[in-house]
Amino acid sequence: AWELTILHTNDVHSRLEQTSEDSSKCVNASRCMGGVARLFTKVQQIRRAEPNVLLLDAGDQYQGTIWFTVYKGAEVAHFMNALRYDAMALGNHEFDNGVEGLIEPLLKEAKFPILSANIKAKGPLASQISGLYLPYKVLPVGDEVVGIVGYTSKETPFLSNPGTNLVFEDEITALQPEVDKLKTLNVNKIIALGHSGFEMDKLIAQKVRGVDVVVGGHSNTFLYTGNPPSKEVPAGKYPFIVTSDDGRKVPVVQAYAFGKYLGYLKIEFDERGNVISSHGNPILLNSSIPEDPSIKADINKWRIKLDNYSTQELGKTIVYLDGSSQSCRFRECNMGNLICDAMINNNLRHTDEMFWNHVSMCILNGGGIRSPIDERNNGTITWENLAAVLPFGGTFDLVQLKGSTLKKAFEHSVHRYGQSTGEFLQVGGIHVVYDLSRKPGDRVVKLDVLCTKCRVPSYDPLKMDEVYKVILPNFLANGGDGFQMIKDELLRHDSGDQDINVVSTYISKMKVIYPAVEGRIKFSTGSH
């Protein structure tokens, strides 16, 4: 038998420095977690102790903090090289700055293979990107060989900016021939490493013949066997065992997100490359693990350039700004309310005595809110805090939509509720009631909107044929997160101001903020 240790990360989202327990900015260093310096300590400790170790990343290193805002991916290549990652799969966020923003800082600089079997380049891009990412890579591990085959969410064109010259194929369809090729080349230990979410990870384990292990990302899934060491609630045991269609037991793993944990999976293979056993758990990278001094020094050196962003206080919050995915993708969150209020405030235009304002409504995809802000840092809110919340460099735009389009959008918001997907809408100037006992597409039971043509704003039922103005992220205006109905049916679209700037201006204007959860989004069961 031959034993392989798979160390894995996913959805690190630019958390190069240690963070607080909720993955926002580190406030109390003695209680902080993660970061590449601490990760390196643990990785090196395991490499020294165990013979056959692979360090893998399942995508979405890009996007999430000021590090990416400033360094645009160069930081990812530099520190992943320093940690000596063995392979990385492309995530959807690797395309946030377009293909050029992937090629130049990361693909050309990485000293490790970057993988995706289901992304096919066409046109002039094909020759430009050729060889810079691969469908698979055969890696030497001790005296054995291991094949790693990559995959990326086929939803990426809806979630990011890959352009028109990359085709995202069905994962399973694309993976099978690559796995077959690896087997034909005598590679009998194959890991699927990718970024399509836990449900797809499980499907790959079930459907792709020859895959021995699946290491995933995208859904920030936390798996754990036994008592979990922090706040994350396990979605299942680690590893999660899937019985494949050909009767094999295939371990599937993911390691939450934000570099808080290091996935640790031990696999035992027989001489034919069959998995005999698998066990492990994510390792919580808490302060009991020291930060590596050399990596920490390097972080501090790179950090200097960021300090202009970090030091400027924009205003204060006297409440916790809950921007966690656990809240904002499931229910009204006060970070969503804050942002929407800022978006409306930024669009106050008293141009007509008949209207208190030309626009009263805001919608914001919960998945676009990427971090909370802890008030226990003297209440200070900085550019860096906001860059972690709104890392995408988008704009808040003005559109005109029919009521019927808005209704469709709110149905889409909850059509697959409960899977922590980003399309759950946060709102301003809207009161919505959902009944989740009803079938998808028929769950919005009440939708009231704030009047504009009124001296005293009040909420009235949405009219299907009326045209409304709405402030929303350009991401949604462009049909992102599956809001194709907005893109297809919008009657007018005017691009607006930079998202962080809108919120920072609002906070600076307000000086002290205390957004609440106030019943903008409600859930009910029964007749209406």
Epitope: S130, G131, K183, T184, E271
Partner: antibody, heavy 125, light 110 residues
């Protein structure tokens, strides 16, 4: 030593069938993909088929697809090529060969590193 | 019809250097390693060289290989009479899902 010994060639009429065998020794047969390659008189080498180490994956050249079947018996260290609906243009010397993934440093090279002695198949009426 | 193209013949006098080219595409040479085989009449083909100059034991170092983009080449320096044979390049082809051989080059020692 590592060797592949072939058998089963001969003269056969068009439309008939023939089965070639290849006996392996000196290496762990079940760890290697195996190929069949042929050379028609006066022509170059033509790849025919491959089978993965465990027999689960098989690929064929377009010229033989649907007529030839590659198989293996790992318990007997044997490789086979079942040739049905033979045609005149299948006349060739057939070779079995071992597919080898060689590691040199961190680079892997794939080649056919061990070959059988060849067996002549003549399709003629 | 082979998808790897080689010149049909090459020749040289003893001691000379002979180079054989092998042209393919992104689905074979472009994305996979190349091997070269020597085939003497009446014998089985023999693996001669891997891409980037790696030779199996017993193959003299006057044989060298290289690859650039979608092409490969085999060089024989210090040509000897026993080098008279047919030479084939080969690579896995991802589009065809199979191993492909070149058209073959007959090397003659004058």
């Amino acid at each position: 030593q590592v060797q592949l010994v072939q058998s089963g060639g001969g003269v056969v009429q068009p439309g008939r069938s023939l089965r070639l065998s290849c006996a392996a020794s000196g290496f762990t047969f079940s760890s290697y993909g195996m190929h069949w390659v042929r050379q028609a008189p006066g022509k170059g080498l033509e790849w025919v088929a491959v089978i993965s180490y465990d027999g689960s994956i098989k690929y064929y050249a377009d010229s033989v697809k649907g007529r030839f079947t590659i198989s293996r018996d790992n318990s007997k260290n044997s490789l086979f090529l079942q040739m049905n609906s033979l045609r005149d243009d299948d006349t060739a010397t057939y070779y079995c060969a071992r597919g080898h993934l060689l590691r040199i440093g961190d680079i892997f090279y794939y080649s056919l590193d061990v070959w059988g002695q060849g067996t002549l198949v003549t399709v003629s009426s | 019809q082979s998808v790897l193209t080689q010149p049909p013949s090459a020749s040289g006098t003893p001691g000379q250097r002979v180079t054989i080219s092998c042209s393919g595409s992104s689905s074979n040479i472009g994305s996979n390693t190349v091997s070269w085989y020597q085939h003497l009449p009446g014998t089985a083909p023999q693996l001669l060289i891997y891409t980037n100059n790696h030779r199996p034991s017993g193959v003299p170092d006057r044989f060298s290989g290289s690859k650039s983009g979608t092409s490969a080449s085999l060089a024989i320096s210090g040509l000897q009479s026993e080098d008279e044979a047919d030479y084939y390049c080969a690579a896995w082809d991802d589009s065809l899902s199979g191993y492909v051989f070149g058209t073959g080059t007959k090397v003659t020692v004058l």
